[in-house]
Interface confidence: medium
């Protein structure tokens, strides 16, 4: 168990022309707050999948009113951290969504008005117990600066918060500076001390004396960005003679820029130059947004939490497809029971029931024989959605009102002759045949 903590440092207009001055105005004062959603793993998860690791909402920030003519100050932010407790192991790799919300206070008709100003998303590797990691994300014209970390709640320890160390009530036999560790009472654990000089920002350790690097950093103390090296041949093999430290593959190896973007290395990482219609760190975000109204048939447009989707359409009942462009054939699910006919009216489903059945889905079997009478001693048999009469000998028809000629159906096989009799029929068989119907 532990807590993921998010600290928002600033939210405001990003660099470059066309950036908004402020999300609030003199006429409509507002306040900001943030919501974070966490999902485990780095997988390509659908935007609508739940925040399986948890979600948290910040307090609402101070009310801000823009002063016309005054320089735009930093927007006032809510106090405190956003904390997302997790009960199980910290997964190490996770996806996040951070939303910036605005609450307008000047328009009180029908209560306060909300709007989502920006949504950023990313996937990260993070060890619990490590230092704060800093990040900058851009969403449209807005820029969000934040730090995050995962920490274990006692008695959990370790990079996944899965090991338990709890003090025993009995006096400890461990030496000074050591703590008893469950489940082995005799095992003593030293407080985790990383290798001397290990970068507090870019390194962490799971064993005392080691220094493991976060993604993007290398070197014995995790102080060297992966894209720089003192070696003449930055891609060359490690050389024991020169003591040359070789970082991993270059950040542009394999071209991380999607959708035809071109990659160029920077001192700390890489930069993608995106073709028209795409943006994002890796040109992964399509230029189509909810502002373009991509959802048809009354679908609700929600900005995509996944970098591969700039928007998600949530379709009303009866429609499907990425833009709610396809009508669902709801009758294909055969919702009408007992042979009822399904009618999709668009706004609703209707079932036209066969005789003897009723209900919205023809689920009720009516008493077919109620109020029905069979003539001439016949008995009513219920079933199949309609009543049926089992008639006495010599009678037929739906209600046993017709005199029946038992020989009309030519029941005697192989040329046998049929004779009507009060008890039914009698077959006189042709030579060489026998049986009640001359069938043998």
């Amino acid at each position: 168990a532990g807590v993921f903590e998010l600290q928002i440092h600033s939210f405001g207009p990003g660099p470059g022309p066309g950036a908004p001055r402020s999300p609030c105005s003199a006429r409509l004062p507002c306040r900001l707050f943030f919501r974070v959603c966490l999902k485990p793993g780095l997988s390509e998860e659908a935007a609508e999948s739940p925040c399986a690791l948890g979600a948290a909402l910040s307090a609402r920030g101070p009310v801000y009113t823009e002063q016309p003519g005054a320089p735009a100050p930093d927007l006032p932010l809510p106090d405190g951290l956003l904390q997302v407790p997790f009960r199980d192991a910290w997964p190490g790799t996770f996806s996040f969504i951070i939303e910036t919300w605005r609450e307008e206070l000047g328009d009180q008709i029908g209560g306060p008005a909300w709007s989502l100003l920006a949504r950023v998303a990313g996937r990260r590797r993070l060890a619990a117990g490590g230092p704060w990691a800093r990040d900058i994300q851009r969403a449209g014209a807005w820029e969000l600066r934040f730090s995050y970390r995962a920490r274990c709640e006692p008695p959990a320890v370790g990079t996944a918060c899965t090991r338990l160390c709890r003090p025993r009530s009995a006096p400890s036999r461990c030496g000074p500076g050591l703590r008893p560790c469950a489940p082995l009472e005799d095992e003593c654990e030293a407080p985790l001390v990383c290798r001397a000089g290990c970068s507090p920002e870019h390194g962490f350790c799971e064993q005392p004396g080691e220094c493991r690097c976060l993604e993007g950093w290398t070197g014995p103390l995790c102080t060297v960005p992966v894209s720089t090296s003192s070696c003449l041949s930055p891609r060359g093999p490690s050389s024991a003679t020169t003591g040359c430290l070789v970082p991993g593959p270059g950040p542009c190896d394999g071209n991380p820029c999607a959708n035809g973007g071109s990659c160029s290395e920077t001192p700390r990482s890489f930069e993608c130059t995106c073709p028209r219609g795409f943006y994002g760190l890796r040109c992964e975000v399509s230029g189509v947004t909810c502002a373009d109204g991509p959802c048809f048939n009354g679908g609700l447009c929600v900005g995509g939490a996944d970098p591969d989707s700039a928007y998600i359409c949530h379709c009303p009942p009866g429609f499907q497809g990425s833009n709610c462009e396809k009508r669902v054939d709801r009758c294909s699910l055969q919702p009408c029971r007992n042979g009822g006919l399904c009618l999709d009216l668009g706004h609703a489903l209707r079932c036209r029931c066969r005789a003897g059945f009723a209900g919205p889905r023809c689920e009720h079997d009516l008493d077919d024989c109620a109020g029905r009478a069979c003539a001439n001693g016949g008995t009513c048999v219920e079933g199949g959605g309609a009543h049926r009469c089992s008639c006495a000998l010599g009678f037929g028809g739906r209600d046993c009102r017709e005199r029946a000629d038992p020989c009309a159906a030519r029941p005697c096989a192989h040329g046998g002759r049929c004779y009507a009799h009060f008890s039914g029929l009698v077959c006189a068989c042709a030579p060489g045949y026998m049986g009640a119907r001359c069938e043998f």
């Epitope: 707050f33 919501r35 974070v36 959603c37 935007a47 609508e48 999948s49 739940p50 925040c51 948890g54 979600a55 948290a56 909402l57 910040s58 609402r60 969504i97 307008e104 328009d107 029908g110 209560g111 306060p112 008005a113 909300w114 709007s115 989502l116 100003l117 949504r119 947004t289 909810c290 502002a291 609700l300 447009c301 929600v302 900005g303 939490a305 928007y311 998600i312 949530h314 009303p316």
Partner: nanobody
Framework: EVQLVESGGGSVQAGGSLRLSCAAS????????MGWFRQAPGKEREGVAT????????YYADSVRGRFTISQDNAKNTVYLQMNSLKPEDTAMYYC??????????????????????WGQGTQVTVSS
Amino acid sequence: EVQLVESGGGSVQAGGSLRLSCAASGYTYSSNFMGWFRQAPGKEREGVATIVSGGGTTYYADSVRGRFTISQDNAKNTVYLQMNSLKPEDTAMYYCAAGGPPTNGAKWYPLRPPGYNYWGQGTQVTVSS
């Protein structure tokens, strides 16, 4: 597909209490808000209370503030409406709704029906004097 199922409605004397529950299945991330609305015969549907999922932010209509409390059990994906000091004018069909504002900056009101794209079938609350 999100499905919302309300329960807990019934008849009660003025001054009494009821607790409504709304269980959500197929609940999606886009449904940032869950709310309770009500509709009395011959009247428009009106917002009663709204809660933001993943946080405790709540909104109440003026007519119920101080008497009604909305809460959420994230583990059970259930939203509750505790109604105390009920009045005859609280008599209505109560609906649970889930939805979220658009992401293009358009205004959205937590206590108004537009923007709530998922609705339950409703549960009747009758308060007699």
